[in-house]
C-alpha cells in the first residue's frame, strides 16, 4: 500500500478520505486506527456503527469522527481541532471477522496555525527534510508519500 | 393510504417454525428498509432484525438473541416483507409488528420508524 | 452494548400539567434518539426523532430535547388522549428501547 499525506492546520478541523471497492467490501463494517510504531500492532481509534445498514451515522471517539459510504464506496474521518500529538501513521481498514483488509495507509500531518503566533517548535513534521513542492498546502489536502519519505519520527 | 399489514401468528410447538408476513400499501416499497419487532406480553419493545431497500440489495441484519434462527426477507413484486422463524422457543412468544423506516433521501434513512402494522400474535407452547 | 434508564416507570398526572420523562444512555449516543407512543393494544407511534425533531403530524405539546447521555420527552400540556406508554429508542450502538413509562390520568 502507498502511503496518502493528509496535512490539516492544528486547531482545525482534518477530513480523510479513503475511497474503496464498495461490491469488495459489501456487508463488512470499518475502522480507523493508528500505527503504533512502524512494525508496531495498528490501535483502532473508532470504527463504524455496529449494523452495517447503518454505516453512514457519524460515530464519534473523542475528537475523531467516522461514516462510511457504502453505497459510493468512500470511507471518511474527521479529526477535529488537530493537535500536534495528531500526527502519525494511520489506516482506513475494512473488517471481516476477526480479519481486517487496509482500505488505505494515511500519513497525517499537523502544520502550524499562520494566526497563531505561539512557539510553534512542538509541531512534528514527518520527513520535513524532504521536499514538499509538490504539495499544495491547504486545509486537508493530501498527497502519496515521496519515496524515501519516513512516515515516522526519528526515534532520539 | 400508507399502510402495513402482519399475517401469519399463531400457536406453534417449541422448536417448530412459522412465517409471518408483512404486506405493505400506499407507498414505493423497494426504496424503504423495513424492521421486524416484537412485544412479550405486558413487556417493553425489542427490534427483531430489519433489511434493507433495494439500494443496499435487501442485506439484513438481526438482533443476537435471534440470530441464525430467523431470517427476514422481502418481494418487491408483492411488496411484502416476510419474517420465518426457524427453532422457536417459548421466550419468542410475542406480538410481532413489522415497521418502515424513516427515509430522508434513496441512500439515507434513520432507524425512526414511522409507519407499524397492527402486529400479529405468536405463541410458543407445548 | 448500551442500556437505555427510562424513567419514572410510571406517574399520574392532571389534564393540563406538563408531564416529563427522561431518558439516560449508559454511554454517549449524540443525539441517536427517538421517541414513541403506545396505546393498549395498539402499535407504537412515532412521536420524535432524532431526539428534538416532531414527526408530521403530531401535535406540538409534544418535544424532545437533549444530547450525550441525558434526554427529556416533554408534554406541555396533558390531554386525556395522551393516556398510553412512552418509549424512548436508542441508534447508536444497535436498536434498543428503554423500560417505558405509563401516563395514567389522575
Known amino acids: 500500500h502507498n502511503t496518502t499525506v493528509f496535512q490539516g492546520v492544528a486547531g482545525q478541523s482534518l477530513q480523510v478520505s479513503c475511497p474503496y471497492d464498495s461490491m469488495k467490501h459489501w456487508g463488512r463494517r470499518k475502522a480507523w486506527c493508528r500505527q503504533l510504531g512502524e512494525k508496531g500492532p495498528c490501535q483502532r481509534v473508532v470504527s463504524t456503527h455496529n449494523l452495517w445498514l447503518l454505516s453512514f451515522l457519524r460515530r464519534w471517539n473523542g475528537s475523531t469522527a467516522i461514516t462510511d459510504d457504502t453505497l459510493g464506496g468512500t470511507l471518511t474521518i474527521t479529526l477535529r481541532n488537530l493537535q500536534p500529538h495528531d500526527a502519525g501513521l494511520y489506516q482506513c481498514q475494512s473488517l471481516h471477522g476477526s480479519e481486517a483488509d487496509t482500505l488505505r495507509k494515511v500519513l497525517v500531518e499537523v502544520l502550524a496555525d499562520p494566526l497563531d503566533h505561539r512557539d510553534a517548535g512542538d509541531l512534528w513534521f514527518p520527513g520535513e527534510s524532504e521536499s514538499f513542492e509538490d504539495a499544495h498546502v491547504e486545509h486537508s489536502i493530501s498527497r502519496s508519500l515521496l519515496e524515501g519519505e519516513i512516515p515516522f519520527p526519528p526515534t532520539s | 393510504e400508507v399502510q402495513l399489514v402482519e399475517s401469519g401468528g399463531g400457536l406453534v410447538q417449541p422448536g417448530r417454525s412459522l412465517r409471518l408476513s408483512c404486506t405493505a400499501s400506499g407507498f414505493t416499497f423497494d426504496d424503504y428498509t423495513m424492521s421486524w419487532f416484537r412485544q412479550a406480553p405486558g413487556k417493553g419493545l425489542e427490534w427483531v432484525g430489519f433489511i434493507g431497500s433495494k439500494a443496499y440489495s435487501a442485506t439484513t441484519e438481526y438482533t443476537a438473541s435471534v440470530k441464525g434462527r430467523f431470517t427476514i426477507s422481502r418481494d418487491g413484486s408483492k411488496s411484502i416483507a416476510y419474517l420465518q422463524m426457524n427453532s422457536l422457543k417459548t421466550e419468542d412468544t410475542a406480538v410481532y409488528y413489522c415497521?418502515?423506516?424513516?427515509?430522508?433521501?434513496?441512500?439515507?434513512?434513520?432507524?425512526?420508524?414511522?409507519?407499524w402494522g397492527q402486529g400479529t400474535m405468536v405463541t410458543v407452547s407445548s | 452494548d448500551i442500556q437505555m434508564t427510562q424513567s419514572p416507570s410510571s406517574l399520574s398526572a392532571s389534564v393540563g400539567d406538563r408531564v416529563t420523562i427522561t431518558c439516560q444512555a449508559s454511554q454517549d449516543i449524540t443525539n441517536y434518539l427517538n421517541w414513541y407512543q403506545q396505546k393498549p393494544g395498539k402499535a407504537p407511534k412515532l412521536l420524535i426523532y432524532?431526539?428534538?425533531n416532531l414527526e408530521t403530524g403530531v401535535p406540538s405539546r409534544f418535544s424532545g430535547s437533549g444530547s450525550g447521555t441525558d434526554f427529556t420527552f416533554t408534554i406541555s400540556s396533558l390531554q386525556p388522549e395522551d393516556i398510553a406508554t412512552y418509549y424512548c429508542?436508542?441508534?447508536?450502538?444497535?436498536?434498543?428501547f428503554g423500560g417505558g413509562t405509563k401516563v395514567e390520568i389522575k
Open positions: 432524532d431526539a428534538s
Open positions: 429508542q436508542e441508534y447508536d450502538s444497535y436498536i434498543t
Open positions: 415497521a418502515r423506516g424513516k427515509r430522508y433521501s434513496y441512500t439515507y434513512w434513520t432507524p425512526a420508524f414511522d409507519v
